[in-house]
Amino acid sequence: APVRSLNCTLRDSQQKSLVMSGPYELKALHLQGQDMEQQVVFSMSFVQGEESNDKIPVALGLKEKNLYLSCVLKDDKPTLQLESVDPKNYPKKKMEKRFVFNKIEINNKLEFESAQFPNWYISTSQAENMPVFLGGTKGGQDITDFTMQFVSS
């Protein structure tokens, strides 16, 4: 069976949108009006992994691009990157673990925990126009809560 996917956008809990910054980086900033068209549309795929009532394993690809968010060690630190893949082979049900995020739903907000690096989350800074990154703390200065907006195909 083919992997199930849906198109969506994500905003952090401060309502910052995610946009491309160069070919392999996302940044978070407040957008208004026509600028909203700049925001990244994700293809969220529902992949194999440990699932529970509030936790669902997903992969986050960029719609119509051969890029997926992935988590790797760089200089011994878990790091978020955009990784180029072969479109003939992706998305797939059994994604490599570096591509998998546990989508956790709490009080109508979403967290995206790295399956590869438990307790590390997709994060944004309080500051405007800063890169989206993988953070190892929840409830601190950095933002780990998101909302999801569905986008028609």
Partner: nanobody
Framework: EVQLLESGGGLVQPGGSLRLSCAAS????????MGWVRQAPGKGLEWVSS????????YYADSVKGRFTISRDDSKNTLYLQMNSLRAEDTAVYYC????????????????WGQGTLVTVSS
């Protein structure tokens, strides 16, 4: 043509049990995650349970966990829901859904569903 035919519903007293079945045809049953959703009178659809392709993973809504058991028999192209310790609030039409994927706690995607079978829990 995909067909899903549920059966096994009926009237049961609180604390009683029922076993629902869903006979599937028109697709390669064993390849797909399957599940059950329900609709209580005057309410919206509610996800109940899912079972992965190959049946090695099962998932349940909190409201039925420990009381309901989902299973499948790929040789018979049939999905089951064993419902024990039934309560009045379990009264609903139960639908079998093909390629069921949960998106959020109260949102899911599926390709096909059956016509449903009514379960009434009342004394």
């Amino acid at each position: 043509e995909v067909q899903l035919l549920e059966s096994g519903g009926g009237l049961v007293q609180p604390g009683g049990s029922l076993r629902l079945s869903c006979a599937a045809s028109g697709f390669t049953f064993e390849d797909y995650q399957m599940g059950w959703v329900r609709q209580a009178p005057g309410k919206g659809l509610e996800w109940v349970s899912s079972i992965s392709a190959m049946g090695n993973r099962t998932y349940y809504a909190d409201s039925v966990k420990g009381r309901f058991t989902i299973s499948r028999d790929d040789s018979k192209n049939t999905l089951y829901l064993q419902m024990n310790s039934l309560r009045a609030e379990d009264t609903a039409v139960y639908y079998c859904a093909e390629n069921l994927v949960r998106v959020l706690l109260n949102k899911w995607m599926f390709d096909y569903w059956g016509q449903g079978t009514l379960v009434t829990v009342s004394s």
